[in-house]
């Protein structure tokens, strides 16, 4: 009696259980009563990442430099190419199909987390006692200068965008 279900890594065709082709290989012809499945490797720049009965391999992803992309990991016959973004850029999606320039944190904000190839810069407002006077994708909020440790006094209070201004202590004559 012909089978209605097949074992793992097999498929049912013409009432016959045939072996699936291994990752990296495509199906050329199905098995018969007398012959095994015919499989051949994927061509250059092609891949199949599962046990399969595909008659065509998938093309490796192209990391288009015009979109700010570069190859992070070269594809094989069993894996797709992994793209990432050029320095200073990050992916717009998980699939990393294009890149955008990393965001800079405005004055009054510092970098909480530096951007990576796949995530943008995370900014945070500078809390009391800290400032940032530049627009930057790298600079954290800096602490206000401690006038006391320099035997100076605060002449001008700091803000989230400016450091304190220290000056000499008034001398008693």
């Amino acid at each position: 009696e012909p089978p209605t279900a097949c074992r793992e890594k097999q498929y049912l065709i013409n009432s016959q259980c045939c072996s699936l082709c291994q990752p990296g290989q495509k199906l050329v012809s199905d098995c018969t009563e007398f012959t095994e499945t015919e499989c051949l490797p994927c061509g250059e720049s092609e891949f199949l990442d599962t046990w399969n009965r595909e008659t065509h391999c998938h093309q490796h992803k192209y990391c288009d430099p015009n979109l700010g992309l570069r190859v992070q990991q070269k594809g094989t016959s069993e894996t797709d190419t992994i793209c990432t973004c050029e320095e200073g850029w990050h992916c717009t999606s998980e699939a990393c199909e294009s890149c955008v320039l990393h965001r800079s944190c405005s004055p009054g904000f510092g970098v909480k987390q530096i951007a990576t190839g796949v995530s943008d810069t995370i900014c945070e407002p500078c809390p009391v006692g800290f400032f940032s006077n530049v627009s930057s994708a790298f600079e954290k909020c800096h602490p206000w200068t401690s006038c006391e440790t320099k035997d100076l006094v605060v002449q001008q209070a700091g803000t989230n965008k400016t450091d304190v201004v220290c000056g000499p202590q008034d001398r008693l004559r």
Epitope: Q22, V28, S29, C31, F34, E36, E38, E44, T76
Partner: antibody, heavy 119, light 107 residues
Framework: EVQLVESGGDLVKPGGSLKLSCAAS????????MSWVRQTPDKRLEWVAT????????YYPDSVKGRFTISRDIAKNTLYLQMSSLKSEDTAMYYC????????????WGAGTTVTVSS | DIVLTQSPATLSVTPGDSVSLSCRAS??????LHWYQQKSHESPRLLIK???QSISGTPSRFSGSGSGTDFTLSINSVETEDFGMYFC?????????FGSGTKLEIK
């Protein structure tokens, strides 16, 4: 008995052409992918061409791509290798081989035919 | 292209010795590695397919092992008829490639 018999090897001048044949018997020729493999005078083996069982897929290394063509005639149980623009580095013993279906290892080899490219 | 490096290039042994022939791939080829024996003035003959599967007619003293990049052909107690060339061959990627061979000779 499974058998592969090559013919057509000859002495040919650089730039010349040659067609090798391989007569298959003792198995269902149309069920198997076939290949040509050559062995150079220094005894190195080099894969030259592959054709799938139905003839729909052909593959070549860069060294022969555009110069060599593999084909098959199912009705005649014969495999062919058309070679053109021959170079001295094509000098070798050419073997016709049958491939396993699921695993394309070369499970049957012919006795070979000698191709010499020299002026 | 995948490069297959066979070692040693020549192995001189006495009948009765047990030997191991190595084949190393330049990148992973899963288990798509095959071994051939070629005696003087003869065509190559498939001994082992898929790294470790014996072919019908291959004597039991021959065995294959390995996966990925490192493969071994072992001959348990070499017989005089075993002398000749041994080639490894990968069919994981195009172009198919062969190792340069190991010559097994009588000491």
């Amino acid at each position: 008995e499974v058998q592969l018999v090559e013919s057509g090897g000859d002495l040919v001048k650089p730039g010349g052409s040659l067609k090798l044949s391989c007569a298959a018997s003792g198995f269902t020729f149309s069920s198997y992918g076939m290949s040509w493999v050559r062995q150079t005078p220094d005894k190195r083996l080099e894969w030259v061409a592959t054709i799938s069982s139905d003839g729909s897929h052909t593959y070549y290394p860069d060294s022969v791509k555009g110069r060599f063509t593999i084909s098959r005639d199912i009705a005649k149980n014969t495999l062919y290798l058309q070679m053109s623009s021959l170079k001295s580095e094509d000098t070798a013993m050419y073997y016709c081989v049958r491939q396993g279906r699921y695993v394309p290892s070369f499970d049957v080899w012919g006795a070979g035919t000698t191709v010499t490219v020299s002026s | 292209d995948i490069v297959l490096t066979q070692s040693p290039a020549t192995l001189s042994v006495t009948p009765g010795d047990s030997v191991s022939l190595s084949c190393r791939a330049s990148q992973s080829i899963r288990n798509n590695l095959h071994w051939y024996q070629q005696k003087s003035h003869e065509s190559p003959r498939l001994l082992i397919k898929d790294a470790s599967q014996s072919i019908s007619g291959t004597p039991s003293r021959f065995s294959g092992s390995g996966s990925g990049t490192d493969f071994t052909l072992s001959i348990n107690s070499v017989e005089t008829e075993d002398f000749g060339m041994y080639f490894c061959h990968q069919t994981n990627n195009w172009p198919f490639t062969f190792g340069s061979g190991t010559k097994l000779e009588i000491k």
